[in-house]
Interface confidence: low
């Protein structure tokens, strides 16, 4: 049994300033999601993203870039696998208020103004304020109605049939809602309508199938509204199921679909004996032919540090379902021979996510990686170059005497990615070379000393320093460095005169 997710900030409610940004973090022992007040069409400024941390918990962040009155409401964080259609969402909640002096009440959809009361049950008239401090009164045709008010829900009470208006005053300005209409229904007269479309994306020539089912009701009139309706393209069928309970299944079939059949498919059920109407809608899109869109979440040149773990995520939209494969340097990735894995996950009906995972980046992982997505109608690819960044290291430091001239050349070979930079230092007092202050950087413009640098390949560089004449023993230091690290080595240069004396001895 998982403990409930937790939310930061750890508060039951929070008041957020209008037009400011806010973020809510949810931590759970399994994958977590957010449910929030607005519909998907309205939520362009709500961003949900996953975050990694070292706690071992799953973290999902909800970010609102510019808070408005419509963001007022209950934000629920829940475990993905616990969400079911029937029960109320189980999770952790925080209620956000966004007070707006020009919007006293949280905007509602038209259906919210229809309040159904079954028998003599209590009901809620859902006028919620954007500011918890705003006083609200409820009115009907007879005047003020006594009912308990909760700014998170609205007025709760037993209401007679008819129109009700909520009224609030903010900074001396009076606000009124449009009327809430309270209807009374017998509990059994509820219209239970479900719509099902196994697919919402098709291509030309395929058959569109949409069903609507009405439960526990026999006296129902159901109408279809859809793009091909005027041409009489659709075939409608009704199937009556009586066991274990009454269920009317209406099926709309549109054969040989074309692009013009794209649009909203709506079923509207009306109870013949009452003014009870329920509508369900699904948007169907028909494409001329199959398609593929690739959207990488990274650029065409990516760098990774040696031994780093890195994921490259590519979003793919495709229909029909694509085959997704990865190539390295135009060859198929053989996963069992490398510490590189790939996977593909279906996110939605036509949305897929493919991941290329580098477990511990190695130098040989550098190269061009390509994701290829293909179906019977299209093929798309995206290629990026991966560069494994390696700290610089010195491979070799040697000197070379120029015979009788007394000149000497020191060669320093280093490798790393990005290509290391080579710097030379010199210590003229050999007895004091243990002291760092005795070393000086060798400038390019010193007479009798020539420094040069040559790139041998993409990751190896050779630096040379030539001394026209070495008259006394000196120490030379090669320092190779790049963004990831530095290494140095030292070498003693003995003057030719001293060397000959040593030889005689």
């Amino acid at each position: 049994q998982l403990s409930l997710p937790s939310i930061l900030p750890n508060e039951n409610e929070k008041v957020v300033q209008l037009n400011s940004s806010f973020s809510l973090r949810c931590f759970g022992e399994s994958e977590v999601s957010w449910q929030y007040p607005m519909s998907e069409e309205e939520s362009s400024d709500v961003e949900i993203r996953n975050e990694e941390n070292n706690s071992g918990l799953f973290v999902t962040v909800l970010e609102v870039s510019s808070a408005s009155a419509a963001h007022t409401g209950l934000y629920t964080c829940y475990y993905n696998h616990t969400q079911t259609e029937e029960n109320e969402l189980e999770g952790r909640h925080i209620y956000i208020y966004v007070p707006d002096p020009d919007v006293a009440f949280v905007p509602l959809g038209m259906t919210d103004y229809l309040v159904i009361v079954e028998d003599d049950d209590s009901a809620i008239i859902p006028c919620r304020t954007t500011d918890p401090e705003t006083p609200v009164t409820l009115h009907n045709s007879e005047g003020v109605v006594p009912a308990s008010y909760d700014s998170r829900q609205g007025f709760n009470g037993t209401f007679t049939v008819g129109p009700y208006i909520c009224e609030a005053t903010v900074k001396g300005k009076k606000f009124q809602t449009i009327p809430f209409n309270v209807y009374a229904l017998k509990a059994t007269s509820e219209l239970d309508l479900e719509m099902e479309a196994l697919k919402t994306v098709y291509k030309s020539g395929e058959t569109i199938v949409v069903t609507c089912a009405v439960f526990n009701n026999e006296v129902v009139d159901l109408q279809w509204t859809y793009p091909g309706e005027v041409k009489g393209k659709g075939i409608t069928m009704l199937e009556e199921i009586k066991v274990p309970s009454i269920k009317l299944v209406y099926t709309l079939t549109v054969p040989e679909a074309t692009v013009k059949d794209s649009g909203d498919y709506e079923c509207a059920a009306r109870q013949a004996t009452r003014e009870v109407k329920e509508m369900k809608k699904v948007t169907i899109s028909v494409h001329e032919k199959g398609f593929i869109e690739i959207k990488p979440t990274f650029s065409q040149l990516e760098a990774v540090n040696l031994h780093e773990v890195k994921h490259f995520v590519v979003e793919v939209r495709a229909y029909p379902p694509p085959r997704i494969s990865w190539l390295k340097n135009n060859l198929t990735l053989i996963e069992n021979l490398t510490e590189i894995t790939t996977d593909v996950e279906k996110i939605q009906e036509i949305r897929y996510r493919s991941k290329l995972k580098l477990i511990r980046a190695k130098e040989e992982d550098s190269g061009h990686y390509t994701i290829v997505a293909q179906n019977e109608d299209a093929v798309k690819s995206y290629t990026f170059e991966l560069l494994t960044q390696v700290p610089s290291s010195i491979l070799d430091l040697v000197d070379d005497h120029h015979g009788s001239t007394g000149g000497q050349t020191v060669r320093c070979t280093a490798e790393g990615t990005p290509l290391p930079d080579i710097e030379w230092m010199i210590c003229k007092d050999i007895k004091k070379c243990n002291n760092e202050t005795s070393w000086t950087i060798l400038a390019n413009n010193v007479s009798n000393i020539i420094t040069e640098i040559h790139s041998r390949d993409r990751s190896t560089v050779e630096g040379r320093v030539t001394f026209a004449k070495v008259e006394e023993t000196i120490a030379v230091r090669c320092l190779a460095k790049n963004l990831l690290g530095a290494e140095n080595r030292e070498l003693k240069l003995v003057a030719p005169t001293l060397r000959s004396e040593l030889t005689v001895a």
Partner: antibody
Framework: QLQLQESGPGLVKPSETLSLTCTVS??????????WGWIRQPPGKGLEWIGT???????YYNPSLKSRVTISVDTSKNQFSLKLNSVTAADTAVYYC?????????WGQGTLVTVSS | EIVLTQSPDFLSVTPKEKVTITCRAS??????LHWYQQKPDQSPNLLIK???QSVSGVPSRFSGSGSGTDFTLTLNSLEAEDAATYYC?????????FGQGTKVEIK
């Protein structure tokens, strides 16, 4: 409210290095969601993307300027910087810094840099 | 690099008129095309993102459409404050590029 502010000299001599800094306030440059970029606009002309940096230091440059551009980030100061070396009169432009996640949603007010001796 | 070509370069329009600006990409860029408005001596301002998505705070008279290579910015019932230069921008393939701009003048 997120704000970006460019700063740096308004006049640079030819062949010298143009250096600008963008200070971010009202939000963290270390956000793992966003990248930080430089765009320029020569007088009376269109917009040109120069390059972009992520808070970790990963950089992406426009190939037409790559050999002359360096963009760096200082998360402790909530700043990122642009260096463009070996400038010529053709580099005279208004330089903007901006935040983006594929879309440039917040921009600085821009600073005019003139290259002239 | 992807070249974005806007048309027309210049428009002179009377208030309340409908304005359409097109942007054509030199290769397929999916829907990662965005529109910006720039008024004289101001920074560009994001109008439409991902070809057709509206942006908070932008008047509803601005809308966008298109995918693949051909995109459209529509201004329904132009107002005096809409006098500006409009740029399209793609963020599909590096280097990110902008269109050359369309200047809209109010008669």
């Amino acid at each position: 409210q997120l704000q970006l502010q460019e700063s740096g000299p308004g006049l640079v001599k030819p062949s010298e290095t143009l250096s600008l800094t963008c200070t971010v306030s009202g939000g963290s440059i270390s956000s793992s969601t966003y990248y930080w970029g430089w765009i320029r606009q020569p007088p009376g002309k269109g917009l040109e993307w120069i390059g972009t940096i992520y808070y970790s230091g990963s950089t992406y440059y426009n190939p037409s300027l790559k050999s002359r551009v360096t963009i760096s980030v200082d998360t402790s100061k909530n700043q990122f910087s642009l260096k463009l070396n070996s400038v010529t009169a053709a580099d005279t432009a208004v330089y903007y810094c901006a935040r983006h996640h594929w879309v440039f949603d917040y921009w600085g007010q821009g600073t005019l840099v003139t290259v002239s001796s | 690099e992807i070249v974005l070509t806007q048309s027309p370069d210049f428009l002179s329009v009377t208030p309340k008129e409908k304005v359409t600006i097109t942007c054509r990409a030199s290769q397929i860029i999916g829907s990662s095309l965005h529109w910006y408005q720039q008024k004289p001596d101001q920074s560009p301002n994001l109008l439409i993102k991902y070809a057709s998505q509206s942006v908070s705070g932008v008047p509803s008279r601005f809308s966008g459409s298109g995918s693949g290579t051909d995109f459209t910015l529509t201004l329904n019932s132009l107002e005096a404050e809409d006098a500006a230069t409009y740029y399209c921008h793609q963020s599909t393939i590096l280097p990110w590029t902008f269109g050359q701009g369309t200047k809209v003048e109010i008669k």
